[in-house]
């Protein structure tokens, strides 16, 4: 994380600042809904453990076409160190359990808020 | 398979409207965006703008007071409407789908020709 | 608005040489870590096919023989070696920022 580029600024971003993006543009998808998110799209819930960040692009990669989580989709692949593709599975999801977007989002934002707050960025 | 196919109306006069349909198949609308772009006879490609599933239109800021994108989910069908032909819009229309993340455009439909003329 | 410019405009390779075709954004096109930057290939009479993704991933079903490479503002699509199926006219697209752009393309003659 402490590599990663693009957040803000040219060079490399504090994890600090990468993280509170990621949390800022996830507050904002979940006050700016209105109709269903991503039309009601389901993903395969996670594990909120290490690891998190390629899991939860993982599941976010298959939904397509929702405008509204396409920066948080780049967002995670900037925080991923290995590609992901649509359709790849890690053992992270909890693979009986599907849940909408909208919930997935609240789940993940919940979980980096109180990542954030314990000064765990990496 | 995934298909995408446009239909148009071949001819428009000048300062007549254009309007196009893109007819998807194998695919839902709603979970995918479909993107409109157009190459004139001999030229290179041009992004006229895109429908997102969940309904957001994006237009290329050049050609915006001109265009109108919109769809019918139900009958799996797109729309391009566009105003105030000239000769310089005689170009093949191509509707085209994006991928999942980090959506490129990896289906097209064959393209619609359209001549501007008197 | 992103501008691509694409060189050269056009070139010849013999067969079985190497093809290499560049792109310059007039900004970078790179976010959190990526580049949003694609290449198709164009068969006259037909419509674009996507070769490369995110400026280096390989598109499913093209053959290894395309790779794209780069980052920020310059980016290089290489085919190497080069087939007679693979004359066509080769474009770069940037997706980072509406509007989406295409370079003005490359074409390919194979000698």
């Known amino acids: 994380l402490t590599c990663l580029g693009g957040f803000a600024s040219p060079g490399p971003v504090p994890p600090s600042t990468a993280l509170r993006e990621l949390i800022e543009e996830l507050v904002n998808i979940t006050q700016n809904q209105k109709a269903p998110l991503c039309n009601g799209s389901m993903v395969w819930s996670i594990n909120l453990t290490a690891g998190m960040y390629c899991a939860a692009l993982e599941s976010l990669i298959n939904v397509s076409g929702c405008s509204a989580i396409e920066k948080t989709q780049r967002m995670l692949s900037g925080f991923c160190p290995h590609k992901v593709s649509a359709g790849q599975f890690s053992s992270l999801h909890v693979r009986d359990t599907k849940i909408e977007v909208a919930q997935f989002v609240k789940d993940l934002l919940l979980h980096l808020k109180k990542l954030f707050r314990e000064g765990q960025f990496n | 398979q995934v298909q995408l196919k446009e239909s148009g109306p071949g001819l428009v006069a000048p300062s007549q409207s254009l309007s196009i349909t893109c007819t998807v198949s194998?695919?839902?609308?709603?979970?995918?965006?479909v993107n409109w772009v157009r190459q004139p006879p001999g030229k290179g490609l041009e992004w006229l703008g895109m429908i997102w599933g969940d309904g957001r239109i994006d237009y290329n800021s050049a050609l915006k007071s001109r265009l109108s994108i919109s769809k019918d989910n139900s009958k799996s069908q797109v729309f391009l409407k566009m105003n105030s032909l000239q000769t310089d819009d005689t170009a093949r229309y191509y509707c085209a789908r994006d991928g999942y993340y980090p959506y490129a455009m990896n289906y097209w439909g064959q393209g619609t020709s359209v001549t501007v003329s008197s | 608005n992103i501008v691509l410019t694409q060189s050269p405009a056009s070139l010849a390779v013999s067969l079985g040489q190497r093809a290499t075709i560049s792109c310059r954004a007039s900004?970078?096109?790179?976010?959190?870590?990526?580049?949003?930057m694609h290449w198709y290939q164009q068969k006259p009479g037909q419509p674009p096919k996507l070769l490369i993704y995110l400026a280096s991933n390989l598109e499913s079903g093209v053959p290894a023989r395309f790779s794209g490479s780069g980052s920020r503002a310059d980016f290089t699509l290489t085919i190497d070696p080069v087939e007679a199926d693979d004359a066509a006219t080769y474009y770069c697209?940037?997706?980072?920022?509406?509007?989406?752009?295409f370079g003005g393309g490359t074409k390919l003659e194979i000698k």
């Open positions: 697209q940037q997706n980072n920022e509406n509007p989406r752009t």
């Open positions: 900004e970078s096109v790179d976010s959190y870590g990526n580049s949003f």
């Open positions: 194998e695919f839902s609308l709603t979970g995918s965006s």
